[in-house]
Amino acid sequence: KESCDVQLYIKRQSYHSIFAGDPFKLECPVKYCAHRPQVTWCKLNGTTCVKLEGRHTSWKQEKNLSFFILHFEPVLPSDNGSYRCSANFLSAIIESHSTTLYVTDVKSASERPSKDEMASRPWLLYS
């Protein structure tokens, strides 16, 4: 029997390598059965996840899954870091794994490095 718990499909240790100045959509895939839960995004600051208020968010519906999207328009160097989405469901909080944005400031990079280079070259990243 299929579980009717809310599930948030962000992979553990996932990351996105992106560039300052570009638009970017960070998606939180949400599986639910009857009522769509309230979902929020937060940004990790050490062990605390600070709720992101007043940001542009939207929902996208696909066949078996909904996506709660955090929009970066555009990406700023200060957007570098780890993010988590949370769902409020039956008075319980379900938290996703965190996903990390590695932001490269194109002004400081002579050419755009590959995704793997960026993930392994922390001196390109902003904290």
Epitope: R12, Y15, H16
Partner: antibody, heavy 119, light 112 residues
Framework: EVQLVESGGGLVQPGGSLKLSCATS????????IHWVRQASGKGLEWIGR????????KYAASFKGRATISADDSKNTAYLQLNSLKTEDTAVYYC????????????WGQGTLVTVSS | DIQMTQSPSSLSASVGDRVTITCRSS???????????LNWLQQKPGKAPKRLIY???KLDSGVPSRFSGSGSGTDFTLTISSLQPEDFATYYC?????????FGQGTKLEIK
């Protein structure tokens, strides 16, 4: 039925390259991380690296960085390991493993493929 | 890199025995989500490894309940409560909390 089937092993000359395939079925490869692990005869397991088939992001053990390339084609539900500049000490059984990325709900291993590096 | 040290390296035991294998990591395997990503694998000669336990203590589907895992931080244990003939194999711990992921050197469980 869940399956991971490696292929592409065999005899390779020192200095040569190999490309191994890992064909998966019974689950959506995009929901997983694909790992490549090797085992020399009579020895333990050695982690080579990991690929996220959903976006291509890859991590490698330091000793394989620059020599190994792990990739996946989610349309074929297949992952790949390319290893260059082969040495005799790369002789081993190479395994792919698929671990569910969200809730750790499964961790499947292929049967392995033997690579022999010899002149 | 995190070193994973298993003990003992080999072990002779009889059917029905209770067996304990330990795995010590050189640093904590506690991730920032509060979980330790420690797996136990079983490998029989000429066969692929098979995951038995994940997240320290969760049993994979179809794994007999005589297998159990415990521990936290840096010290972890695999226990087989009553050895069966099919349990004679090599067991590996594997951490996937920190990159690069690392394995213990293995514990070979043999029939006494």
């Amino acid at each position: 039925e869940v399956q991971l089937v490696e292929s592409g092993g065999g005899l390779v000359q020192p200095g040569g390259s190999l490309k191994l395939s890992c064909a998966t079925s019974g689950f959506n490869i995009k929901d997983t991380y694909i790992h490549w692990v090797r085992q020399a005869s009579g020895k333990g397991l050695e982690w080579i690296g990991r690929n996220d088939p959903a976006n291509g992001n890859t991590k490698y053990a330091a000793s394989f960085k620059g020599r190994a390339t792990i990739s996946a084609d989610d349309s074929k539900n297949t992952a790949y390991l390319q290893l260059n500049s082969l040495k005799t000490e790369d002789t081993a059984v190479y395994y792919c493993a698929s671990y569910e990325g969200y809730y750790e709900r499964f961790g499947y291993w292929g049967q392995g493929t033997l690579v022999t590096v010899s002149s | 890199d995190i070193q994973m040290t298993q003990s003992p390296s080999s072990l002779s035991a009889s059917v029905g025995d209770r067996v304990t294998i330990t795995c010590r990591s050189s640093q904590s395997l506690l991730d920032r989500d509060g979980k330790s990503y420690l797996n136990w694998l079983q490998q029989k000669p000429g066969k692929a490894p098979k995951r038995l336990i994940y997240l320290v203590s969760k049993l994979d589907s179809g794994v007999p309940s005589r297998f159990s895992g415990s521990g936290s931080g840096t010290d972890f244990t695999l226990t087989i409560s009553s050895l069966q003939p099919e349990d004679f194999a090599t067991y590996y711990c594997w951490q996937d909390t920190h990159f690069p992921y690392t394995f213990g050197q293995g514990t070979k469980l043999e029939i006494k």
